[in-house]
């Protein structure tokens, strides 16, 4: 019995087609992805093949103005329109709190939303009961397939799930649910979830009875043969894991941002064993036309976004200096504003011993592309922020050793004076440079804000200590020559859309007046 699994993950509100790098579409003839194009391909496959499931492995939320404005209603509407069969909860589904998940998505979705390792307690337990499930048995043709969901147990550090959701270990939580499916005579089981490729592989290895793993969170691109675009494969598609009980379990992921549609064909025998698995992600490029009815719907929903862009988010009573003359040479108040917003967006009081789990921010000065003049009645709009942060990036959470941070700050000024983008703006860090010294030895003082303290204060950086840092995804991926970050990071979790982080902060503060205050000397 042959099953076709179509899958997406980490779409991050890319409802409209995007450029090849998943930023805003400029030249339509070269654009990719988007729900209208995705629907064309999905329908084409549904017509051609008998047993098809369309699955999403989480993180539909967060990433563009679509989410900022519609807050998840757009996810429910268009996933319903595409007739998704199931979705797993990702960490970003909790970005607007549990209410921001329940009302727009859980209550509106016409497909099951799954996670076996999230357990509700207290008053929330009855409120959320039945709105998401640990597993769902789906009829597919003459057969039935069990889908079990899972979500990163790091979600409390990455999003805002509140205090009434407990995130259990994925493997511990999945096994009893899979066992339950087996007792219901369901012998074809897909684990669909959002914990990253390493955990996907562990689930394939450790959870008895799981036949296929469809994952997300790590934006992993897998491909067999010559890849069709710029993404470099982390392995073959599907990636085969040998389970502890001696079975070959295919593991798949489909990069991110709706650029690809994962396409996996599985042949099962009567016992539910995977006899064969093959496929590849399908690049959703302009050779696939956008479905006209979905496109028309997108255009209808788009109108509200254009209006939102010009509305006031808050006010500034000072000039926000985002000029390259400042931000690539010295501490600039636009850099301070952005870093403060980045830390504020990551306030998670999950441990009494820590005032917060992260206190530090670094930001490449070259990523700040425009100032904002306060003389326009102080008004700040989304449009203004889009000029400051035009690249559609995210502010991510990484774990780095102190020694890596020291290398990063040396790199920041290794060719100081040439107006290059690698000069770092900071938050929760005091750095002193001596530019008379030779490159690679210019950082003379590097103090960092403590986290395991009730009164935050600055302490000298320890080379062997592991620190959490918020930074742009551009830096996490080694951009502007920060190869040491990419090579040496110990953990990387993608965060929220850059503009959204700053806009939320400005809306929260109402009036802002960031200063230059001696963070960089």
């Amino acid at each position: 019995w042959e099953l076709t699994i179509l899958h997406t993950n980490d779409v991050h509100s890319r409802l409209e087609q995007t450029s090849e790098d998943s930023s805003k579409c400029v030249n339509a003839s070269r654009c990719m992805g988007g729900v209208a194009r995705l629907f064309t391909k999905v329908q084409q496959i549904r017509r051609a093949e008998p047993n098809v499931l369309l699955l999403d492995a989480g993180d539909q939320y967060q990433g563009t103005i679509w989410f900022t404005v519609y807050k998840g209603a757009e996810v429910a509407h268009f996933m319903n329109a595409l007739r998704y069969d199931a979705m797993a909860l990702g960490n970003h589904e909790f970005d607007n709190g549990v209410e921001g998940l329940i009302e727009p998505l859980l209550k509106e979705a016409k497909f099951p939303i799954l996670s076996a390792n999230i357990k509700a307690k207290g008053p929330l337990a009855s409120q959320i009961s039945g709105l998401y499930l640990p597993y769902k048995v789906l009829p597919v043709g003459d057969e039935v397939v069990g889908i079990v969901g899972y979500t990163s147990k790091e979600t409390p550090f990455l999003s805002n799930p509140g205090t009434n959701l407990v995130f259990e270990d994925e493997i511990t939580a999945l096994q009893p649910e899979v066992d339950k499916l087996k007792t219901l005579n369901v012998n074809k089981i897909i684990a669909l979830g959002h914990s990253g490729f390493e955990m996907d592989k562990l689930i394939a290895q450790k959870v008895r009875g799981v036949d296929v793993v469809v994952g997300g969170h790590s934006n992993t691109f897998l491909y067999t043969g010559n890849p069709p675009s710029k993404e470099v494969p982390a392995g073959k598609y599907p990636f085969i894991v040998t389970s502890d009980d001696g079975r070959k379990v295919p593991v798949v992921q489909a990069y991110a941002f709706g650029k690809y549609l994962g396409y996996l064909k599985i042949e099962f025998d009567e016992r539910g064993n995977v006899i064969s698995s093959h496929g590849n992600p399908i690049l959703l490029n302009s050779s696939i036309p956008e479905d006209p009815s979905i496109k028309a719907d997108i255009n209808k929903w788009r109108i509200k976004l254009d209006n939102y862009s010009t509305q006031e988010l808050g006010k500034t009573i000072v000039y926000l200096d985002g000029s390259s003359q400042s931000c690539r040479f010295r501490e600039c108040n636009m850099g301070n504003l952005i870093c403060d917003a980045m830390i504020n967006n990551n306030l998670r009081h999950t441990d009494e011993m820590f005032w917060n789990h992260v206190s530090m921010c670094i930001l490449n000065g070259g990523g700040i592309r425009s100032p904002i003049d306060e003389r326009n009645n102080g008004t700040i709009t989304w449009e203004n922020l889009a000029a400051v942060l035009p690249f559609g990036g995210t502010f991510d959470l990484v774990q780095l050793k102190g020694s890596t941070l020291k290398k990063a700050f040396e790199h920041s000024v290794h060719r100081y004076g040439q107006s290059t983008g690698e000069f770092l703006q900071v938050g929760g860090i005091h750095v002193v440079y001596d530019l008379s010294r030779k490159p690679g030895d210019r950082v003379v003082k590097l103090d960092v804000l403590c986290t395991k303290c009730r009164v935050p204060s600055y302490d000298p950086l320890k080379m062997d200590e592991v620190y959490k840092v918020i930074l742009p995804n551009f830096l996490a991926n080694g951009g502007d020559g920060f190869q040491m970050i990419k090579d040496e990071l110990l953990r990387h979790d993608s965060g929220d859309q850059d503009i959204n982080v700053v806009s939320t902060y400005i809306s929260k503060m109402k009036v802002i007046y960031p200063a230059v205050e001696g963070r960089i000397k």
């Epitope: 019995w1 070959k248 025998d269 064993n273």
Partner: antibody, heavy 114, light 107 residues
Framework: EVQLVQSGAEVKKPGASVKVSCKAS????????MNWVMQAPGQGLEWMGR????????FYSQKFKGRVTMTVDKSTSTVYMELSSLRSEDTAVYYC???????WGQGTTVTVSS | DIQMTQSPSSLSASVGDRVTITCRAS??????LNWLQQKPGGALKRLIY???SLDSGVPSRFSGSGSGTEYTLTISSLQPEDFATYYC?????????FGGGTKVEIK
């Protein structure tokens, strides 16, 4: 649990036909196909062909083409294998086996003798 | 048709021995290979499917490996109940074909 139960032993004369049945249970019958495998006395296994339960599509090994007919009765989840123009070298045990031979019938002995 | 050449055709071994049986295909069959066990009474049982996946209930002393045209069944420590005949089967293309069998006997 998958189970395949085959019909009993048969003794046939050369030139006659034999029809062996295989009743399946414990799985969604229409979603799969059935194989037939022959084993002559003291010999190895030989694949004869297969039938898809849902629509009766068949694929026969060239060696048996023209003499073998596989059919299916969905209402009783039973598959049949008929072998015609029997000769002495058709004396063998005939097995039905699921899609990828994960489960086997107990075998049906067919003796062709004058 | 794809020919499956199985070797050895028979072998004698003692309990606890490591036993290796090989199947060579006349052309590349990908991972489309099963290993079957037939006990003297005639009952057939699949041990390994898709080259290396172990059927449920099959002891972990059985393992399969290989790719392309060369495939191996290994019994890491032979047990009394393992004395039987073993067959490989390719299902990469029609007609499916079996190896000639390997009879594992007590030394």
């Amino acid at each position: 649990e998958v189970q395949l139960v085959q019909s009993g032993a048969e003794v046939k004369k050369p030139g006659a036909s034999v029809k062996v049945s295989c009743k399946a249970s414990g799985y969604t019958f229409t979603a799969y196909f059935m194989n037939w495998v022959m084993q002559a006395p003291g010999q190895g296994l030989e694949w004869m062909g297969r039938i898809y339960h849902n629509n009766g599509d068949t694929f026969y090994s060239q060696k048996f083409k023209g003499r073998v007919t596989m059919t299916v009765d969905k209402s009783t989840s039973t598959v049949y294998m008929e072998l015609s123009s029997l000769r002495s070298e058709d004396t063998a045990v005939y097995y039905c086996a699921t899609s990828y031979v994960g489960d086997w019938g107990q075998g049906t002995t067919v003796t062709v003798s004058s | 048709d794809i020919q499956m050449t199985q070797s050895p055709s028979s072998l004698s071994a003692s309990v606890g021995d490591r036993v290796t049986i090989t199947c060579r295909a006349s052309q590349d069959i990908g991972d489309s290979l099963n290993w079957l066990q037939q006990k003297p009474g005639g009952a057939l049982k699949r041990l390994i499917y898709a080259t290396s996946s172990l059927d449920s209930g099959v002891p972990s002393r059985f393992s399969g490996s290989g790719s392309g045209t060369e495939y191996t069944l290994t019994i890491s420590s032979l047990q009394p109940e393992d004395f039987a005949t073993y067959y490989c089967l390719q299902y990469a293309s029609f007609p499916w074909t079996f190896g000639g069998g390997t009879k594992v006997e007590i030394k």
